[in-house]
Interface confidence: low
C-alpha cells in the first residue's frame, strides 16, 4: 500500500508522459490523477515504467474502478495487464475481440498464464459460444487452446468455427474431445470433394466411427500411420483386412512396425490369419485358419 502524501508543488501530472519515470512511487500516487491515467492508458505502454511504478498505476485504477475496469481502459492496459490477478480479471466484462487481441498480444510468446485463462474464460462466456473469429484468434496464440477445453465446453463450438482449426491445434486433444469435434468437422467440410475433404478431416479422425472409416476406405485416401494410430480402437476393430489395406494404401507396410501397439495389436487379434497373410507383411496373432469366429461384442456389452 502506498502512503498518501500531498503532491509537491509543480509536480502535478498534466499528461501521462516520459517525465513520470523519474517520479518516486509516492509521487506517482500523489501527483497522477486516476481519471487522467484512465483516459491516457494507451500512453503507459510506450513509457519504460519500473514494475514498482506499474504497481502504483494499477493501484490508482483499482481505486477508481473498484467494481472492475471499463473496456475502454482494458483495451489499452498493455503491459499493465501482466500485473492483473485472475481475481481482478473476473470483475471485467470484455466483449470486443480487439480488446482480447490487444491483451493476448502482450502475453505473446509465453505459456498461457492463469490471468490469460481467466480472460479467455470471461470473454467466451460473455459471447455464449466460441465463434470462428475468437477461435482463430485464440489458436493463433495458443495452438493447444482447443484441447484445454472440456467436452462440454467444446460442444458450444459451432461447426463454422472448425474452419479456423489447424492440425497442430488438435495435437494434445484426447479421444473424448475428438468425439465432440469430429461430428462438427464432418458437418463443416461436408461439401468438399474427396481428397480435399480428407486433408481437412484428417486431424479430427480420432473421433470417427467405424462406418465413416469404412466410407473413407473406398476413396483412395492413403491415410498415414500416424493418423491411423490415433483412431479409436473400437472404431478400427470391425474393419476388415481389405478395408484397412484400402484405407492406408501404400502406408499399409507401416503396420508391421506398429503390430505390438494399439489399435493395430487389437485389430490383428480380430482378423483371420489367412486374411492377414494376404498383406505379405508377416503380421502374426490373427485367428488361426479353421477356427469359428463368434461376435462376442454383444455378450461383452451385457456382461
Amino acid at each position: 500500500e502506498v502512503e498518501k502524501t500531498a503532491c509537491p508543488s509543480g509536480k502535478k501530472a498534466r499528461e501521462i508522459d516520459e517525465s513520470l519515470i523519474f517520479y518516486k512511487k509516492w509521487e506517482l500516487e500523489a501527483c497522477v490523477d486516476a481519471a487522467l491515467l484512465a483516459t491516457q492508458m494507451d500512453r503507459v505502454n510506450a513509457i519504460p515504467f519500473t514494475y514498482e511504478q506499474l504497481d502504483v498505476l494499477k493501484h490508482k485504477l483499482d481505486e477508481l474502478y473498484p467494481q472492475g475496469y471499463p473496456e475502454s481502459v482494458i483495451q489499452h492496459l498493455g503491459y499493465l495487464f501482466l500485473k492483473m490477478s485472475p481475481e481482478d480479471i473476473r470483475k471485467w466484462n470484455v466483449t470486443s475481440l480487439e480488446t482480447l487481441k490487444a491483451l493476448l498480444e502482450v502475453n505473446k510468446g509465453h505459456e498461457m498464464s492463469p490471468q490469460v485463462a481467466t480472460l479467455i474464460d470471461r470473454f467466451v462466456k460473455g459471447r455464449g459460444q466460441l465463434d470462428k473469429d475468437t477461435l482463430d484468434t485464440l489458436t493463433a496464440f495458443y495452438p493447444g487452446y482447443l484441447c484445454s477445453l472440456s467436452p462440454e465446453e467444446l460442444s458450444s463450438v459451432p461447426p463454422s468455427s472448425i474452419w479456423a482449426v489447424r492440425p497442430q491445434d488438435l495435437d494434445t486433444c484426447d479421444p473424448r474431445q475428438l468425439d465432440v469435434l469430429y461430428p462438427k468437422a464432418r458437418l463443416a467440410f461436408q461439401n468438399m470433394n474427396g481428397s480435399e475433404y480428407f486433408v481437412k478431416i484428417q486431424s479430427f479422425l480420432g473421433g470417427a466411427p467405424t462406418e465413416d472409416l469404412k466410407a473413407l476406405s473406398q476413396q483412395n485416401v492413403s491415410m498415414d500411420l500416424a493418423t491411423f494410430m490415433k483412431l479409436r480402437t473400437d472404431a478400427v476393430l470391425p474393419l476388415t483386412v481389405a478395408e484397412v489395406q484400402k484405407l492406408l494404401g501404400p502406408h499399409v507396410e507401416g503396420l508391421k512396425a506398429e503390430e505390438r501397439h494399439r489399435p493395430v495389436r487389437d485389430w490383428i487379434l480380430r482378423q483371420r490369419q489367412d486374411d492377414l497373410d494376404t498383406l505379405g507383411l508377416g503380421l502374426q496373432g490373427g485367428i488361426p485358419n479353421g477356427y469359428l469366429v463368434l461376435d462376442l461384442s454383444m455378450q461383452e456389452a451385457l456382461s
Epitope: 494507451d42 505502454n45 498493455g78 498480444e105 505473446k108 493463433a140
Partner: antibody
C-alpha cells in the same frame, strides 16, 4: 490498387539519423500490422521489426534502441526512424504489410519497392 | 531465439526439373512458416503462408509442406521465371529474435 511506396532513403554520414516513410494506398493502414525488412547489397533479408494494429512494436534484438517504428493512420503512413547509423546499415529498406487484417505473425503479402540507404563518409 | 537454417544455399536446375528447398527451425514453430521468392532488384513476393497455404495468384506448381521444425518448398516443374532466390520466414515468434528469415536459396540455370 493495393500499394506501398517507401521514401526518405539516401546518403547519410556515420552517426547520422534518417527517417524513412512508407505510404500505403488501396487499403486502410490502421487495419494491418506493418513491418520493415532490409537487405544489404548481395545479402539476404533481415527483419527489423513491425508495429501492430494497436501500436505495439516488436524489434529484432540488434535493432532495439537505434530503430523506432511508428505509424500515422490518418496519413496512411508508417515510419522507420534510424539513429546512430553505421556503414553496416547500408541496405535497401522495404516496408511490408501483414497478410491478415488485424493480426500479426502470418507473413508479409504486400511489399514496397524499397528505398536505398547508404551510410558513408 | 528461433534460428532458421535453409538448405541448400544454392542449386542449379533445368526447366522442367522438380526442385526442393528445405528450411529447419531450431525449435517447434508448428506450421507458422512463410516462403518468399525474390528476383534481382525486386521486392520479395509471398508464395506460401502457414507452411502449406498458397498465397493469392501463386501458380500451383509451388507447394509447401512440413510442420514442427522441418519444412519444404517444392517447385514441381521449374519454369524460366522461377530462377530466383527463395527465403523461408518463421512467423511463430517476434520476441527476442535476431532474424526470422532463412539464409536464402539461389536457384540458377544448369
Amino acid at each position: 490498387q493495393v500499394q506501398l511506396v517507401e521514401s526518405g532513403g539516401g546518403l547519410v554520414q556515420p552517426g547520422g539519423s534518417l527517417r524513412l516513410s512508407c505510404a500505403a494506398s488501396g487499403f486502410s493502414l490502421s487495419s494491418y500490422a506493418m513491418g520493415w525488412v532490409r537487405q544489404a547489397p548481395g545479402k539476404g533479408l533481415e527483419w527489423i521489426g513491425y508495429i501492430s494494429t494497436i501500436n505495439n512494436t516488436y524489434y529484432a534484438s540488434w535493432a532495439k534502441g537505434r530503430f523506432t517504428i511508428s505509424r500515422d493512420n490518418s496519413k496512411n503512413t508508417v515510419y522507420l526512424q534510424m539513429n546512430s547509423l553505421r556503414a553496416e546499415d547500408t541496405a535497401v529498406y522495404y516496408c511490408a504489410r501483414e497478410i491478415r487484417s488485424g493480426w500479426v505473425d502470418y507473413g508479409f503479402s504486400i511489399w514496397g519497392q524499397g528505398t536505398l540507404v547508404t551510410v558513408s563518409s | 531465439d528461433i534460428q532458421m537454417t535453409q538448405s541448400p544455399s544454392s542449386l542449379s536446375a533445368s526447366v522442367g526439373d522438380r526442385v526442393t528447398i528445405t528450411c529447419q527451425a531450431s525449435q517447434n514453430i508448428y506450421s507458422n512458416l512463410a516462403w518468399y521468392q525474390q528476383k534481382p532488384g525486386k521486392a520479395p513476393k509471398l508464395l506460401i503462408y502457414d507452411a502449406s497455404d498458397l498465397a493469392s495468384g501463386v501458380p500451383s506448381r509451388f507447394s509447401g509442406s512440413g510442420s514442427g521444425t522441418d519444412f519444404t518448398l517444392t517447385i514441381s516443374s521449374l519454369q524460366p521465371e522461377d530462377f530466383a532466390t527463395y527465403y523461408c520466414q518463421q512467423v511463430r515468434s517476434s520476441s527476442d529474435i535476431d532474424n526470422p528469415f532463412g539464409t536464402g536459396t539461389k536457384v540458377t540455370v544448369l
